[in-house]
Interface confidence: medium
Amino acid sequence: MNSFNYTTPDYGHYDDKDTLDLNTPVDKTSNTLRVPDILALVIFAVVFLVGVLGNALVVWVTAFEAKRTINAIWFLNLAVADFLSCLALPILFTSIVQHHHWPFGGAACSILPSLILLNMYASILLLATISADRFLLVFKPIWCQNFRGAGLAWIACAVAWGLALLLTIPSFLYRVVREEYFPPKVLCGVDYSHDKRRERAVAIVRLVLGFLWPLLTLTICYTFILLRTWSRRATRSTKTLKVVVAVVASFFIFWLPYQVTGIMMSFLEPSSPTFLLLNKLDSLCVSFAYINCCINPIIYVVAGQGFQGRLRKSLPSLLRNVLTEESVVRESKSFTRSTVDTMAQKTQAV
């Protein structure tokens, strides 16, 4: 075979076996799963249940408001990205249960594991878009009053999705199914044809575009926003801002292990002990990244409870309150100096 990374998205290799050979083949005499795989299965199960139900609820709540409320558009798109990724989980779950055997065919191998990467790129690009929106609301309120509309928000989301699809293509193209021996099984993974440079390039691009660059820009963005909000009176109830910061922070926390192990594996020799250890942890890192797909609804509910007191409202109305609050006050379009100042303060309720 060719240098094959067996697993979910893109890391996790075989050491080779002409076919796909796991760098750490399943013990030939054992039918028991490794501890990291068992933990991954538990996480996958929880993520699937919470992610499908939670994101479906978020989609339902925000879909009605998305025509007129810009925040609803952002949260709707994030939920759709997460929901799509959750749909692949039963397949990935089944594969791990069968010691990474992939009985679902080549097309499924290309598409389903790529969904989490599509989710990663879509999520971070949407978060970047949301963050830009937050930034503009605080620093360019007049521009927002004039131009910030649902149409522009949908265009921004479409661009984010288009770029996400574009960035997922390399993973999609390199995914293949191969045969593994002793005992026989079919594995689904990424085949770089032993081209370490290509593998490293993909890993570096993913790390930079999907993690480091967004981390840097969003950190700067929110530093400015938070400094501004905290420097003003009457800006302490920054509901949407708190939610967005929590969502952004969780994104980086849960993607960190996957990104770190991925970049390390692309630079390590497949026979090295560190590589072998990381390979064993691959499914766990992927499952950890998958937590992103169910964490947002949890954040929304927790935020809603914080803002509403105990659950006095129904879940949908609680979510509606968190997700569809509009940030820009639509008043007169002729501004005096005092109006601008007042508005800058009001828009802190982001």
Epitope: D15, D16, D18, D21, E179, P183, P184, H194, P270, S271
Partner: antibody, heavy 118, light 112 residues
Framework: QVQLKQSGPGLVQSSQSLSITCTVS????????VHWVRQSPGKGLEWLGV???????DYNAAFKSRLSITKDNSKSQVFFKMNSLQADDTAIYYC????????????WGQGTTVTVSS | DIVMSQSPSSLAVSAGEKVTMSCKSS????????????LAWYQQKPGQSPKLLIY???TRESGVPDRFTGSGSGTDFTLTISSVQAEDLALYFC????????FGAGTKLEIK
């Protein structure tokens, strides 16, 4: 076309080691594994081991302690080394390319006839 | 280890006749995951290296004449030569690759 050419000594002293080199052409060692098999009148065909495309190996348990298979991808060479040879190790030794389909061996070397003398 | 048993050990037939040889394994070679039988057949003519004929129990290797047919599943397998030719004089081996690799002792085909 695919070829596997073997080179190594025909005669080995008892308790000494046997080294055979298998030089391949027509395919790349970074994409295909190479098996080693021997054939003796008394025992028929015996699978000895395999080196896979990424460099990992699987060995026949009966030979694991005294067998080593390595390779040099850039030179398209696979190296077979067996230690502590005895008279019953006298056989024809073959290298063969893995087919990737059913783990079969679709191309074989010409064979190296090895006689272990005491 | 999986033990492979071949029968008969030798047989002599006339050109044009149909011949069948058997191969049995000590455990099933059918993978429940891939739904394939990990059994191959090889032909070794006198003074030559073995040549792959059949893999996955019934898939003919490219370039192999269609008079060679592999069949069977699980533990019982058969190689059939529908119309033996003079050039088919050879030793025929079966080989399992389900759990490492082991070979049968071979069936020697002679032409009357």
């Amino acid at each position: 076309q695919v070829q596997l050419k073997q080179s190594g000594p025909g005669l080995v002293q008892s308790s000494q080691s046997l080294s055979i080199t298998c030089t391949v052409s027509g395919f790349s060692l970074i994409s295909y594994g190479v098996h080693w098999v021997r054939q003796s009148p008394g025992k028929g065909l015996e699978w000895l081991g395999v080196i896979w495309s990424g460099g990992s190996t699987d060995y026949n348990a009966a030979f694991k302690s005294r067998l080593s298979i390595t390779k040099d991808n850039s030179k398209s060479q696979v190296f077979f080394k067996m230690n502590s040879l005895q008279a019953d190790d006298t056989a024809i030794y073959y290298c063969a390319k893995n087919s990737q389909l059913g783990n079969a061996m679709d191309y074989w070397g010409q064979g190296t006839t090895v006689t272990v003398s005491s | 280890d999986i033990v492979m048993s071949q029968s008969p050990s030798s047989l002599a037939v006339s050109a044009g006749e149909k011949v069948t040889m058997s191969c049995k394994s000590s455990q099933s070679l059918l993978s429940s995951r891939t739904r394939k039988n990990y059994l191959a057949w090889y032909q070794q003519k006198p003074g030559q290296s073995p040549k792959l004929l059949i893999y996955w129990a019934s898939t003919r290797e490219s370039g192999v004449p269609d008079r060679f047919t592999g069949s069977g599943s699980g533990t019982d397998f058969t190689l059939t030569i529908s119309s033996v030719q003079a050039e088919d004089l050879a030793l025929y081996f079966c080989n399992q690759s389900y759990d490492l690799l082991t070979f049968g002792a071979g069936t020697k085909l002679e032409i009357k």
